[in-house]
């Protein structure tokens, strides 16, 4: 069973990870962002079902392609680079996964925009945490 | 309404200068990007390049880089195409096109190119 | 430099499907546009983001995407559908747009 100190850690770090998928969803998010558009044409796989941590397995798997549509954002929108961002939100993704159990993702049929993803991986967070607390 | 309208159909001999013209209005001019596209007689649509008047980022297609210029003038909402010295394997009809941004709820959605010029008439020869 | 590959003409008879695709390598992970060109008229969008139709085009029009591949559906064609066809999307890097060579759609 779970601790309270486990439990809290874990609480702690999907509150890092919302903050950070928060901060990037706040730098590309705006009506005047003229990279927007660039950003919108770029397709991100949903998972079927978000419902547990083993399930970030499918945020993990599209890490790399939302490090390449951060690079076409303007680097002041951000406090770090893509890479360095995207970095620390796979550390992140890696301990609330766990490295020992093997989950295969599955996908829905509907792809989705950069927005779209976000929105739906920090309502995964926001869901997740209130859970713990 | 939102409408983009492009000057009159130009005659040009080889080697002469050409700047061609589309002038943005119903809208901020400023925040949305416009690009060029290119169609030569009985052929299909190609992408020539795009502009964001409000800071004027130009990007070109690798097959138009060096061969034409775009820019705009935001304080009179016209963007430009131009020439520097013309070939008769220029002859086509120019449009330009203003990419569409929409806000829905928390949710943004790219339309692609979906305000369109009439379109301008270049004729090149000797 | 990026292409999206066509096919050159798509015959139908009215009230039939038509379909017409576009093959791109960046399509897994790059939205097609689809617009339609009528004679001496200036393109009209008909399918942006892979499906999504904008307001005003009739639901005959569908898109839909798999893979490499991009699809336009003209589902029981009409006579007013004969145009040109093109499908457009971006490179990889996103900072590239690209228009496909266009399908001449024949309704007979």
């Known amino acids: 069973a779970p601790t309270s100190s486990s439990t809290k850690k874990t609480q702690l770090q999907l509150e890092h990870l919302l903050l950070d998928l928060q901060m990037i969803l706040n730098g590309i998010n705006n009506y005047k962002n003229p990279k927007l558009t660039r950003m919108l044409t770029f397709k991100f796989y949903m998972p079927k079902k978000a419902t547990e941590l083993k399930h970030l397995q499918c945020l993990e798997e599209e890490l790399k392609p939302l490090e390449e549509v951060l690079n076409l954002a303007q680097s002041k929108n951000f406090h770090l680079r893509p890479r360095d961002l995207i970095s620390n939100i796979n550390v992140i993704v890696l301990e609330l996964k766990g490295s020992e159990t093997t989950f295969m993702c599955e996908y829905a049929d509907e792809t989705a925009t950069i927005v779209e993803f976000l929105n739906r991986w920090i309502t995964f967070c926001q869901s997740i945490i209130s859970t713990l607390t | 309404q939102v409408q983009l309208v492009q000057s009159g159909a130009e005659v040009k001999k080889p080697g002469e200068s050409l700047k061609i013209s589309c002038k943005g209005s119903?809208?901020?001019?400023?925040?949305?990007?416009i690009g060029w596209v290119r169609q030569m007689p009985g052929k299909g649509l190609e992408w020539m390049g795009i502009?964001?008047?409000?800071?004027?980022?130009?990007r070109y297609s690798p097959s138009f880089q060096g061969q034409v210029t775009i820019s705009a003038d935001k304080s009179i909402s016209t963007a430009y195409l131009q020439w520097s010295s013309l070939k008769a394997s220029d002859t086509a009809m120019y449009y330009c096109?203003?990419?569409?941004?929409?806000?829905?709820?928390?949710?943004?959605?790219?339309?692609?190119?979906?305000?369109w010029g009439q379109g301008t008439t270049v004729t090149v020869s000797s | 430099s990026y292409e999206l590959t066509q096919p050159p003409s798509v015959s139908v008879s009215p009230g039939q499907t038509a379909r017409i695709t576009c093959s791109g390598d960046?399509?897994?992970?790059?939205?097609a546009y689809w617009y339609q060109q009528k004679s001496g008229q200036a393109p009209v969008l008909v399918i942006y983001?892979?499906?999504k139709r904008p307001s005003g085009i009739p639901e005959r029009f569908s898109g839909s995407s798999s893979g490499t591949m991009a699809t336009l559906t003209i589902s029981g064609a009409q006579v007013e559908d004969e145009a040109d066809y093109y499908c457009?999307?971006?490179?990889?890097?996103?900072?590239?747009?690209?228009f496909g060579g266009g399908t001449k759609v024949t309704v007979l």
């Open positions: 096109a203003r990419e569409t941004l929409a806000a829905v709820g928390s949710n943004y959605y790219y339309y692609g190119m979906d305000v």
């Open positions: 119903g809208y901020s001019f400023t925040s949305y990007w």
């Open positions: 502009i964001y008047p409000g800071d004027s980022d130009t």
């Open positions: 960046a399509l897994p992970r790059k939205y």
């Open positions: 983001e892979d499906s």
């Open positions: 457009y999307s971006t490179d990889r890097s996103g900072n590239f747009w690209v």
